[in-house]
């Protein structure tokens, strides 16, 4: 039985050219996280964090994606095309997979502020 829950930064906005942290947090389960996948709205993989092998950032995103903090991901040099859904998939033993969704809106406005529903302690 899957008892865990995924909390995410929810709907966030950030300024074009700026950076943003995508963060998911798995709680309420004894399960062991063996891998976390980060995907973009078109289901292309941005990065994988493997428990044994560490981080792998996919070539297309190498210049603009930084691993962390934690199991999260930092997107840099944001463009308008970065607007859309992002998904974190936690592979856990023995529960299975947990999936979280974040919606990022990249704003032209210089007054755009990065907002998050919660902050990971």
């Amino acid at each position: 039985m899957m008892t865990g829950t995924i909390e995410t930064t929810g709907n966030i906005s950030a300024k074009k050219g700026g950076s943003v942290i995508l963060q998911c947090h798995l709680s309420s389960t004894m399960a062991q996280v063996t891998q976390v996948n980060w995907e973009q709205h078109d289901h292309s993989l941005l990065a994988i964090r493997n428990a044994e092998l560490g981080w792998h950032i996919y070539p297309a995103f190498k210049d603009r994606v930084a691993p962390g903090p934690g199991l999260g991901l930092t997107l840099q040099s944001l463009t308008m095309n970065d607007t859309g859904e992002y998904f974190c998939t936690y592979h856990t033993y023995p529960d299975g997979t947990y999936r979280g969704r974040i919606f990022l809106e990249v704003l032209e406005s210089s007054v755009a502020e990065h907002s998050a529903r919660f902050q990971i302690p």
Epitope: M1, M2, M30, A31, Q32, V33, T34, Q35, N50, A51, E52, L53, H91, T92, Y93, P94, D95, G96, T97
Partner: antibody, heavy 122, light 107 residues
Amino acid sequence: EVQLVQSGSDLKKPGASVRVSCKASGYTFTSYPMNWVRQAPGHGLEWMGWINTNTGNPTYVQGFTGRFVFSLDTSVNTAYLQISSLKAEDTAVYFCARTGGHTYDSYAFDVWGQGTMVTVSS
Amino acid sequence: DIQLTQSPTFLSASVGDRVTITCRASQVISSSLAWYQQNPGKAPKLLIYAASTLQSGVPSRFSGSGSGTEFTLTISSLQPEDFVTYYCQHLHGYPCNFGQGTKVEIK
């Protein structure tokens, strides 16, 4: 070489306790969950539960609660199974086994210890 | 809990025979199933994971198939060392139960 090496066979009297050790080598110990499996003489494999090697949190299958304790010493890459108040029906081979595979669809017990025979007899 | 039922429990065959062992799950487990081989007095050895993926170093005469609730392990041509016991196991959440085993014996 990735391997799990268990402690040797043990003969115990009813009511006593036993501790089985499982030393891992050749991989990052905390990256893979560790399981314990029992096989009574002439019987099949029985999953006893597992321990999260990141947090040390154990999970026990029904029937293996109370007298059974899973623990870790990550400084020496070793998992332990302790059984207290031993009964004749605890006589079995006990295996530790690593959960290999990193994605949910590829999990399996890919590396096993050689097994430890625990005999409980007066 | 998900229960696994293996059939047959005993299987008599000859060297060179093609044999199939079936594992049925009490509910859908997608492809989260593994097969193990166990020699007497030894630890089990992983043969197949994810229902059909051959573990590294395992001879190609072993193959797995199936998804959902019905899975099979096939040995295309039995060798003398294959006359041992085989177990299936699901890894579709807690608890990760094993089947009761199938002993392959020489006819």
